[in-house]
């Protein structure tokens, strides 16, 4: 799992000038088996907000025990609180489930800050506002944790939707989605629409608010506008992609594109921020500062620590630039770009100033583990995790926050050469040489 401002711990080289457009591909992607245009029962099945994660209601065991589960595309374990904890309203009680099976194996997951540990087992799992199926899935019953559960977040577990390679304790523990696809006719695809509020929500509003949709097994066309553009999944562990160019207000950062993907770039719904490698972060902040130079903000703001407040309704969105990430396309030498607004990368924060203020944290931060396209990015887009075709699709979200002057965008194609060179190859560690 990723470190840094990561829930639940918590927030182009060789490219030709990209103004040149290729002819638009006219043929839409063929409909996949079992894929429908509308999934009414799954729309609006997520709640929460970017700062504390988005969760879906799930049931575990027989008779079913209802729990809220954080949707996390940056990990691969299904893990639920299974013992009393001050931050949990409820937890999984294995002894009450007639279908629980103990795997007699422990699991320990440490983070940079905090950890969770528990006992592995299997049980029957379903998603009330999901496909009408029940599957036997691996469950890590969390018995002990530190800085994992979040006070007031309203979720009691985590659904890791990435691949088996990063499952704990090892890749032999089949992730939930793999079990779902194997045991049912659900297509090997899911899509996420995370809807950032754009304004702070108090506790009662969060509990009553709609946070978005997780469409399991398909794509709902009502959740996006325009076209879906797909980027290849580089490797099936995290949802790893390749960024080939970065622009701030249309100005190229002009870095070797390998820097953008050092040591990887992933799409992670369990991380709050857009996290960038150190060099990229520094260049991006310098560029954002320059673009917004009519106002100055303290260093602590750019570090994501201090809040900046404006009188309610007067946030000067126009002084902050748009940010574009160009992603490798499906066609050779073709890329597309996704563009986010300050409404995505300035995260509203509640309860700090007066009700007459709108306060925000800068939600772009530094990473030592590569680029993480967290909720800040995902809240602008409908994101399709097309595992069957090893690709991730982006389209403008029907619920993204914008103003009358600018909107998030997904545009292409653009000519970009030598995109394969943008990927960083993580050296394979020879375990025999590791010091113990």
């Amino acid at each position: 799992t990723q470190h840094g401002i990561r829930l639940p711990l918590r927030s182009g080289l060789g490219g030709a000038p990209l103004g040149l457009r290729l002819p638009r591909e006219t043929d839409e992607e063929p409909e996949e088996p079992g894929r429908r245009g509308s999934f009414v029962e799954m729309v609006d099945n997520l709640r929460g907000k970017s700062g504390q994660g988005y969760y879906v209601e799930m049931t575990v065991g027989s008779p079913p025990q209802t729990l809220n589960i954080l949707v996390d595309t940056g990990s691969s374990n299904f893990a639920v609180g299974a013992a009393p904890h001050p931050f949990l309203h409820r937890y999984y009680q294995r002894q009450l489930s007639s279908t629980y099976r103990d795997l007699r194996k422990g699991v320990y997951v440490p983070y940079t800050q905090g950890k969770w540990e528990g006992e592995l087992g299997t049980d029957l799992v379903s998603i009330p506002h999901g496909p009408n199926v029940t599957v036997r899935a691996n469950i890590a019953a969390i018995t002990e944790s530190d800085k994992f559960f979040i006070n007031g977040s309203n979720w009691e577990g985590i659904l890791g939707l990435a691949y088996a390679e990063i499952a704990r304790p090892d890749d032999s523990l089949e992730p939930f989605f793999d079990s779902l696809v194997k045991q049912t006719h659900v297509p090997n695809l899911f899509s996420l629409q995370l809807c950032g509020a754009g304004f702070p929500l108090n506790q009662s509003e969060v509990l009553a608010s709609v946070g978005g949709s997780m469409i399991i097994g398909g794509i709902d066309h009502s959740l996006y506008t325009g076209s879906l553009w797909y980027t290849p999944i580089r490797r099936e562990w995290y949802y790893e992609v390749i960024i080939v160019r970065v622009e701030i207000n249309g100005q190229d950062l002009k870095m070797d594109c390998k820097e953008y993907n050092y040591d990887k770039s992933i799409v992670d719904s369990g991380t709050t921020n857009l996290r960038l490698p150190k060099k990229v972060f520094e260049a991006a902040v310098k560029s954002i500062k320059a673009a917004s130079s009519t106002e100055k903000f303290p260093d602590g703001f750019w570090l994501g620590e201090q809040l900046v407040c404006w009188q309610a309704g007067t946030t000067p969105w126009n002084i902050f630039p748009v940010i574009s990430l160009y992603l490798m396309g499906e066609v050779t030498n073709q890329s597309f770009r996704i563009t986010i607004l300050p409404q995505q990368y300035l995260r509203p924060v509640e309860d700090v100033a007066t009700s007459q203020d709108d306060c925000y944290k800068f939600a772009i931060s530094q990473s030592s583990t590569g680029t993480v396209m967290g909720a800040v990015i995902m809240e602008g887009f409908y994101v399709v995790f097309d595992r069957a075709r090893k690709r991730i699709g982006f389209a403008v979200s029907a619920c993204h926050v914008h103003d009358e002057f600018r909107t998030a965008a997904v545009e292409g194609p653009f000519v970009t050469l030598d995109m394969e060179d943008c990927g960083y190859n993580i050296p394979q560690t020879d375990e025999s040489t590791l010091m113990t």
Epitope: T294, E295, K296, P298, D299, G300, Q306, L307, V308, V352
Partner: antibody
Framework: QLQLQESGPGLVKPSETLSLTCTVS??????????WGWIRQPPGKGLEWIGN???????YYNPSLKSRVTISVDTSKNQFSLKLSSVTAADTAVYYC????????????WGRGTLVTVSS | EIVLTQSPATLSLSPGERATLSCRAS??????LAWFQQKPGQAPRLLIY???NRATGIPARFSGSGSGTDFTLTISSLEPEDFAVYYC??????????FGGGTKVEIK
């Protein structure tokens, strides 16, 4: 070294507009390293932030005073000014101008203050 | 809204004694907190910024500590000129706006 000096009438009638000017000497108000601000202190009471301004003209105001406050800057005169409209006796205070330094975070240099009394 | 509560309201001490002043925030302000000294008829003077850094020209007997919600200003050995009112201010929420109510350090 850099100094700040407040100036303006010491007596203002209720419902009128209080106007004060802060003159910056020994340095440039156009420095990109600072905001400039106003703080007030009613007699025998604590400090209340009024607002800040950057040399570009960008302003921030205390929400509780926002509807009555205007802060402006005149870089050619190396001055910034405060206007507070519709004053009442509750606006009687010592008014300080100050420099917001240390990365725009802390009031590190203050004027001596000027007492403004609101009375008819 | 973040509220800063200073205690005690008044501290009566003799020169040479150690003074410990407290500032408590209603929610975490990280280490974005300052301390000011104000003598009668004078403007406030910045003593400490970022919770523990002494401002230019401030004697070493003044020290600040704390982070999150609880902060302390310590004057290791009171000098006659240290008897004054002390204010804390948070800048976690920017622009800086919230001052504490003040602690008066008076001669016993």
């Amino acid at each position: 070294q850099l100094q700040l000096q407040e100036s303006g009438p010491g007596l203002v009638k209720p419902s009128e507009t209080l106007s004060l000017t802060c003159t910056v000497s020994g340095g440039s108000i156009s420095s990109s390293s600072y905001y400039w601000g106003w703080i007030r202190q009613p007699p025998g009471k604590g400090l209340e932030w009024i607002g800040n301004i950057y040399y570009s003209g960008s302003t921030y105001y205390n929400p509780s005073l926002k509807s009555r406050v205007t802060i402006s800057v005149d870089t050619s005169k190396n001055q910034f000014s405060l206007k507070l409209s519709s004053v009442t006796a509750a606006d009687t205070a010592v008014y300080y101008c100050a420099r917001l330094g240390h990365g725009y975070n802390y009031f590190d240099l203050w004027g001596r203050g000027t007492l403004v009394t609101v009375s008819s | 809204e973040i509220v800063l509560t200073q205690s005690p309201a008044t501290l009566s001490l003799s020169p040479g004694e150690r003074a410990t002043l407290s500032c408590r925030a209603s929610q975490s302000v990280s280490s974005y907190l300052a301390w000011f000294q104000q003598k009668p008829g004078q403007a406030p003077r910045l003593l400490i910024y970022d919770a523990s850094n002494r401002a230019t020209g401030i004697p070493a007997r003044f020290s600040g500590s704390g982070s999150g919600t609880d902060f302390t200003l310590t004057i290791s050995s009171l000098e006659p000129e240290d008897f004054a009112v002390y204010y804390c201010q948070q800048v976690y929420v920017w622009p800086p706006r919230t001052f504490g109510g003040g602690t008066k350090v008076e001669i016993k």
